[in-house]
Amino acid sequence: EEELQVIQPDKSVLVAAGETATLRCTATSLIPVGPIQWFRGAGPGRELIYNQKEGHFPRVTTVSESTKRKNMDFSIRIGNITPADAGTYYCVKFRKGSPDDVEFKSGAGTELSVRAKPSAPVVSGPAARATPQHTVSFTCESHGFSPRDITLKWFKNGNELSDFQTNVDPVGESVSYSIHSTAKVVLTREDVHSQVICEVAHVTLQGDPLRGTANLSETIRVPPTLEVTQQPVRAENQVNVTCQVRKFYPQRLQLTWLENGNVSRTETASTVTENKDGTYNWMSWLLVNVSAHRDDVKLTCQVEHDGQPAVSKSHDLKVSAHPKEQGSNTAAENTGSNERNIY
């Protein structure tokens, strides 16, 4: 009788993560009697996957009834495959021995490759807000995919970006891989409603890429423009001065009125109006009793936006002139060493 051969007909098997892998193995003879064992890898560090004789292997089932006398089919199924299961599997025939069974013949091996989907891309932006004209970096990460080949693209409002760098790790062979990409985006004043999208395409996704998004509203800060104007009121001795705070984002804003450098009133932006581009407008007014002042009054509208250094705009109120003849536009004045002029 010809000597027993162990036949593994499949050189490689490709399985999607979560599915069941079938590893085929047949022996050409029943003899010598002895069990079959399956191993992942070869050599002294090989991992026992299934032992026909003993042990508990909850993920493994035999294709045929392994206890049947004339069984020569030693194929197995491994359930709920993960990328960690990738490797070369060997079907090994043992002959009975004492005290232990003795390895008799091994199959040529079957390489199990696992196709694993990438995780949903996670896009993260800078820790602090930035103003228009600045360049900010966004990162995109996706993990756990296999095989290594993957495509990543960046978009801003549907327009593909080109300024980005991508790495796939590890560089060598691995059961699964991760991708990390950093894109640079130049902010504009119109970006409150903008989105940055990271798109990942992989063989496991069947042409339906995964997307991760970041809203630029989380990243951008649009500083306000200030305009102070004076309107006459019916009462001879009263003047209404308004401070228009325009095109700012986010909403967090505190306004302080100063009369000749002294705080008159502080208020927080509440009932704002929203512009189409997502920025906000707000207006505050101050009713000034002219008769209470002997000299000219310098009125300053000082705005602290989103925790940034205050900006201000001033208006000179001529007490000697009649309120109705007062001009409505004045030049901005610096009201402190740490404040900025807004034109």
């Epitope: 009788e1 003899i31 010598p32 009697v33 002895g34 026909q52 004789k53 006398r69 021995g97």
Partner: antibody
Framework: QVQLVQSGAEVKKPGASVKVSCKAS????????IVWVRQAPGQGLEWMGW????????NYAQKLQGRVTMTTDTSTSTAYMELRSLRSDDTAVYYC?????????????WGRGTLVTVSS | DIQMTQSPSSVSASVGDRVTITCRAS??????LAWYQQKPGKAPKLLIY???NLQSGVPSRFSGSGSGTDFTLTISSLQPEDFATYYC?????????FGGGTKVEIK
Amino acid sequence: QVQLVQSGAEVKKPGASVKVSCKASGYTFTGYGIVWVRQAPGQGLEWMGWISAYAGETNYAQKLQGRVTMTTDTSTSTAYMELRSLRSDDTAVYYCAREAGSSWYDFDLWGRGTLVTVSS
Amino acid sequence: DIQMTQSPSSVSASVGDRVTITCRASQGISSWLAWYQQKPGKAPKLLIYAASNLQSGVPSRFSGSGSGTDFTLTISSLQPEDFATYYCQQGASFPITFGGGTKVEIK
């Protein structure tokens, strides 16, 4: 046909040795192990030991260790069991059997048995 | 060593009866249990291997079940030729051990 043919009955004196043969035919001898089982009169079955016909490896029952030797001759497809320093309680029918289990041990082919009587 | 305990040691039954013999292992032996039938002056004959597999040529009235430590041999309808002694045997590891036997006698 597939069979195991054992040597004839033996009468031995205490302290002597006995060698029982078991000739296989009809199958590939080296593909299967051989076990020896004995049965004293009116008693149950007692396993004595196992030998691999492929490699000659053996495993003996602890109580017989040092007194029993099992061998094979692959050229004649014959297994042998020698028991030394015989005692009266070694009187039994000695069976050889072929192991058939792939992973485990069970015995699907038996010889007819050899009666060994130990008496002074 | 793995001890094999068979019960009952003897049973009286009539032709057509259903007979059940049990065998308990002192430790888990998976499915590696065999049942043999032995008639006076004859060698044992393998009936069941791997706990539940019927040996080729054995009538289907014989069946085996169990796993781990508790096993059963059932003769669904006793026939005249079934009066004999039955032995269980664990084949999981050396030393191989047999149960004490169950004698099935005519009532």
